[in-house]
């Protein structure tokens, strides 16, 4: 596995590690922001979880996401994307038992209490940027990214590398 | 078959300039960054140039020892990338691969199969 | 710069036994809690193949004879059990952020 620091080796007990018949091989528990410095805030409202992009207050806490990391090989003869070798996916769970998913009908990133194994939807090829940030890719969708959109989180169509690292697709992965 | 084929190496006076190509096939070449890393006996492996994506303007970075001499580019149409050296010097002598990162920006995980460059008079 | 300094320079194990190459950075190379360490193997006249990236993940047709650990500052590489087509020149190398820097290698003669 990855080398992990303390903070990082909290979930064991918390998410059962077996998804899609294979184990994360490592996890990372980070709060996660925009490029821009806002952060991704999850709130309990009607017994469902809704997602936000704000400005925290200066002592505000924030909410931390677990990143589970997965190998993946990608044959480009199998997902006619051009794309081949091996690349890193990535689920992430704000809490136990939900995870974001992609809703590439509404083009909505949204938070699903789900079964194990996970759905595809819940897994993102996780792109490591310039100035230190992080964009993901929907494995169900390639060229589709987590992006903000109106303070809240979207799926951005990237039509070509030539609008990959728009700031709008770009996070910060934070231990803090 | 993923492949890398650079060219353009060979024998030039102190100085001078030379030009290295490389070539991908097999693989949707403008969505990887590219690299060039050379080796040579007396520094062993030395990373030299990196060129991203057209979406951050084809972001370049370049090993202190090369900076304001050496110029990576990339021309996506052709599947190629390319190494500009001028004031070349001894020290400059070594094989020269082209390297593809990953998908997603990890690590270095195509190599081609290099060119020679010798910086002699 | 991160300096990855490597060692042994050399060692020679016998066929069927453990070889263990060890990497240091002089800073840490873990991000978003990943470690950002990876190894090669280079046979003569041959570019580097990659074994191992991200510390401890077999690159594309690596055998599983081959494995990584490490995070932070300190890494290894084991063979085990070693065969005589793993004479070569082993290389440590970081991608946490340019400049992107090599270990000195590792030349493994088999016994």
């Known amino acids: 596995a990855f080398g992990i620091s303390g903070v990082q080796k909290y979930t064991r007990a918390l998410h059962d590690s077996s998804i899609t018949g294979i184990s994360p091989i490592t996890e990372y528990l980070a709060s996660l922001s925009t490029y821009n410095d806002q952060s991704i805030t999850f709130a309990l409202e009607d017994e469902s979880y809704e997602i936000y992009v704000e400005d925290l207050k200066k002592d505000e806490k924030k909410d931390k996401v677990l990143l589970s990391y997965y190998e993946s090989q990608h044959p480009s003869n199998e997902s006619g994307d051009g794309v081949d070798g091996k690349m890193l996916m990535v689920t992430l769970s704000p809490t136990k038992d939900f995870w974001l998913h992609a809703n590439n009908k509404e083009h909505s990133v949204e938070l699903h209490k789900c079964e194990k194994p996970l759905p595809d939807q819940a897994f993102f090829v996780l792109h490591n940027m310039h100035s230190n940030c992080v964009s993901f890719e929907c494995k169900t969708d390639p060229g589709v990214f987590i992006g903000v959109k109106d303070n809240h989180l979207a799926l951005i169509k990237v039509d070509s590398s030539e609008n990959l690292c728009t700031e709008n697709i770009l996070f910060k992965l934070s231990e803090t | 078959e993923v492949k890398l084929e650079e060219s353009g190496g060979g024998l030039v006076q102190p100085g001078g300039s030379m030009k290295l190509s490389c070539v991908a096939s097999g693989f949707t070449f403008n969505k990887f960054w590219m690299n060039w890393v050379r080796q040579s006996p007396e520094k062993g492996l030395e990373w030299v140039a990196e060129?991203?994506?057209?979406?951050?303007?084809?972001?370049?970075d370049y090993a202190e020892s090369v900076k304001g001499r050496f110029t990576i580019s990339r021309d996506d149409s052709k599947n190629s990338v390319y190494l500009q050296m001028n004031n070349l010097r001894a020290e400059d002598t070594g094989i020269y691969y082209c390297?593809?990162?990953?998908?997603?920006?990890?690590?270095?995980?195509?190599w081609g199969a290099g060119t020679t460059v010798t910086v002699s008079s | 710069d991160i300096v990855l300094t490597q060692s042994p320079a050399s060692l020679a194990v016998s066929l069927g036994q453990r070889a263990t190459i060890s990497c240091r950075a002089s800073e840490s190379v873990d991000r978003y809690g990943i470690s950002f360490m990876n190894w090669f193997q280079q046979k003569p006249g041959q570019s580097p193949k990659l074994l191992i990236y991200a510390a401890s993940n077999q690159g594309s047709g690596v055998p599983a004879r081959f494995s990584g650990s490490g995070s932070g500052t300190d890494f290894s590489l084991n063979i085990h059990p070693l065969e005589e087509d793993d004479a070569a020149m082993y290389f440590c190398q970081h991608s946490k952020e340019v400049p992107y820097t090599f270990g000195g290698g590792t030349k493994l003669e088999i016994k």
């Open positions: 390297i593809r990162r990953n998908y997603g920006n990890w690590f270095f995980e195509i």
């Open positions: 060129i991203r994506l057209n979406s951050i303007n084809y972001v370049k």
